[in-house]
Interface confidence: low
């Protein structure tokens, strides 16, 4: 039966969904165990204009000391202001100094990185040390780099589509998920749902993704569903500040019981399925419907409160 | 809701100053980004300048045809944007609109008239 | 500097008629974003980013291209619609609007 439920986007005012990811829309990750230098290269895009960036490089310790030293080339389209951190990481940074501004002195070494295309700074990288990680990302807010994390199974770093970079990089979008909403027609009352839909990844190791729910309204004033839906490999760890109805795939804790794993349900893998999912549970809003690359952490806010549902 | 309130315009003579200021409420003013943009009677939109965040340094940016003579500063304890407008020509007539960039200009005030004119 | 040219420069039409707005850049621009102005009354932002319709803009306004060449488009003029529109790109340093076009009721 089609569920009469036409998803329409929601202003920012009443729903946002900001996220973190390890997919990149081209990348690598290869193992060089014995080099004395760990290069890595970003491929940063930034669409509209001057951007401002967080970038944070992050040790994983071996023995107490990070016995490597870095090299991360950065390759930007258009002017970025760089908020860098990397604490005690022996690193050289090759970039373009007229498209790379720093909000504090680095305090590292810098090269210039000659204004080549992707393919010959790859080359120019590899020359200087085996290619540990290189990413390419579209309009990036912040992104977190773990040096010695690569467990990629290729010993040559070669950029290919889709690709999961694991735990060597996670990183944010600037632009907010679109999140959608409607009426569910025939249904009476004020429950709402909202719905979060993971696609999968392209890497099918299991996953937990933390979900962060913060609804703007009295606790009494709500009455909500939180319907989860993604890949069999991922659970939920959800972070919410309200007591709500949980609807998920996989299995889900509570981030202040984590070590309660909760058995979830089979549940349907299409828009329509998922509305007709949160018809069976008596919503007549939803007031969120997003859908996702796999995350690893997805922040919703939003202040419908069961009230009437605005969209752009 | 996001409000930007332009004032300062007004008559000057070629060669004088003005300053204008941008009144903000209703969002972090220190976190944003504002720019000033100008638009000549009868003509099209044309930008003038950019200061950015604190997070930024505040650095400014200018268009070539301003530079070196207007200036564009923030008090983010009032919550104000200023444009310090110095050596005015006749060209500079326009009405100034002071706005916010969020990956576009996403609001804007209702705009305050400067006349250079002798 | 990119030089956005738009056209038409003013644009005659009735209630109900499609119209199409282009916007030509000298070179190759990541995204477009469009302005709507009225007589007296400062811009308001009304396509983002190429395609995405600003806040409260009605669903009849779309807007495509890449590249170079970008187009806003009214499925159906209504009598609000009347007004100019901008394009603004900031792909590159400095940013830069287009000369506008003044969609006229005919």
């Known amino acids: 039966e089609t569920v009469h439920c036409d998803l329409q986007p929601v202003g920012p005012e009443r729903g946002e969904v900001t996220y973190t990811t390890s997919q990149v829309s081209k990348g690598c990750v290869a193992q060089a165990p014995n080099a004395i230098l760990e290069v890595h290269v970003l491929f940063l895009e930034f669409p509209t204009g001057p951007s401002q960036l967080e970038l944070t490089l992050q040790a994983s310790k071996q023995n107490g000391t990070w016995p490597r030293e870095v090299l991360l080339v950065l390759s930007v389209n258009s002017s970025v202001f760089l908020h860098l951190q990397a604490l005690g990481i022996p690193l050289h940074l090759a970039y373009n100094s007229s498209l790379v501004t720093f909000q504090e002195p680095p305090g590292v070494n810098t090269t210039e990185l000659p204004s080549f295309p992707k393919t010959q700074i790859l080359e120019w990288a590899a020359e200087r040390g085996p290619i540990t990680s290189a990413a390419e990302l579209n309009d990036p807010q912040s992104i977190l780099l773990r040096l010695g994390q690569a467990q990629g199974s290729l010993s040559f770093c070669m950029l290919e589509a889709s690709q999961d970079m694991g735990r060597t990089l996670e990183w944010r979008p600037r632009t907010p998920a679109l999140v959608r909403g409607c009426h569910l027609e025939g249904v009476a009352g004020h429950k709402e749902a909202h719905i979060l839909r993971v696609l999968p990844g392209h890497s099918a190791g299991p996953r937990t993704v933390t979900v962060k729910v913060e609804l703007s309204c009295a606790p009494g004033d709500l009455d909500a569903v939180l319907i989860l839906q993604g890949p069999p490999y991922v659970s939920w760890l959800i972070d919410a500040n309200h007591n709500m109805q949980i609807w998920t795939t996989g299995e889900y804790s509570f981030k202040i019981f984590p070590e309660k794993n909760i058995r979830g349900f089979k549940l349907p893998d299409t828009p329509q399925g998922l509305l007709g999912e949160a018809r069976m549970l008596n919503a007549s809003i939803v007031a969120s419907f997003v859908e996702l690359p796999l995350a690893s952490i997805v922040s919703l806010h939003a202040s419908s409160c069961g009230g009437r549902l605005q969209t752009s | 809701e996001v409000q930007l309130v332009e004032s300062g315009g007004g008559l000057v003579k070629p060669g004088g100053s003005l300053r204008l200021s941008c009144a903000a409420s209703?969002?972090?003013?220190?976190?944003?980004?504002m720019d000033w943009v100008r638009q000549a009677p009868g003509k099209g939109l044309e930008w003038v300048g950019e200061?950015?965040?604190?997070?930024?340094?505040?650095?400014?940016y200018y268009a070539e045809s301003v530079k070196g003579r207007f200036t564009i500063s923030r008090d983010d304890s009032k919550n104000t944007l200023y444009l310090q407008m110095n050596s005015l020509k006749t060209e500079d007539t326009a009405v100034y609109y002071c706005?916010?960039?969020?990956?576009?200009?996403?609001?804007w005030g209702q705009g305050t008239l400067v006349t250079v004119s002798s | 500097d990119i030089q956005l040219t738009q056209s038409p420069s003013s644009l005659s039409a009735s209630v109900g008629d499609r119209a199409t707005i282009t916007c030509r850049a000298s070179s190759s621009v990541s995204y477009m974003h469009w302005y709507q102005q009225k007589p007296g009354k400062a811009p308001k932002p009304w396509i983002y980013?190429?395609?995405n319709l600003a806040s409260g803009v009605p669903s009849r306004f779309s807007g495509s291209g890449s590249g170079t060449d970008y187009t806003l488009t009214i499925s159906s003029l209504q009598p609000e619609d009347f007004a100019t529109y901008y394009c603004q790109q900031w792909s590159s340093n400095p940013l830069t609007f287009g000369g506008g076009t003044k969609v006229e009721i005919k």
């Open positions: 200061i950015r965040s604190r997070a930024s340094n505040h650095a400014t």
């Open positions: 209703g969002f972090t003013f220190s976190d944003a980004w």
């Open positions: 980013a190429s395609s």
């Open positions: 706005t916010r960039w969020r990956r576009f200009f996403d609001s």
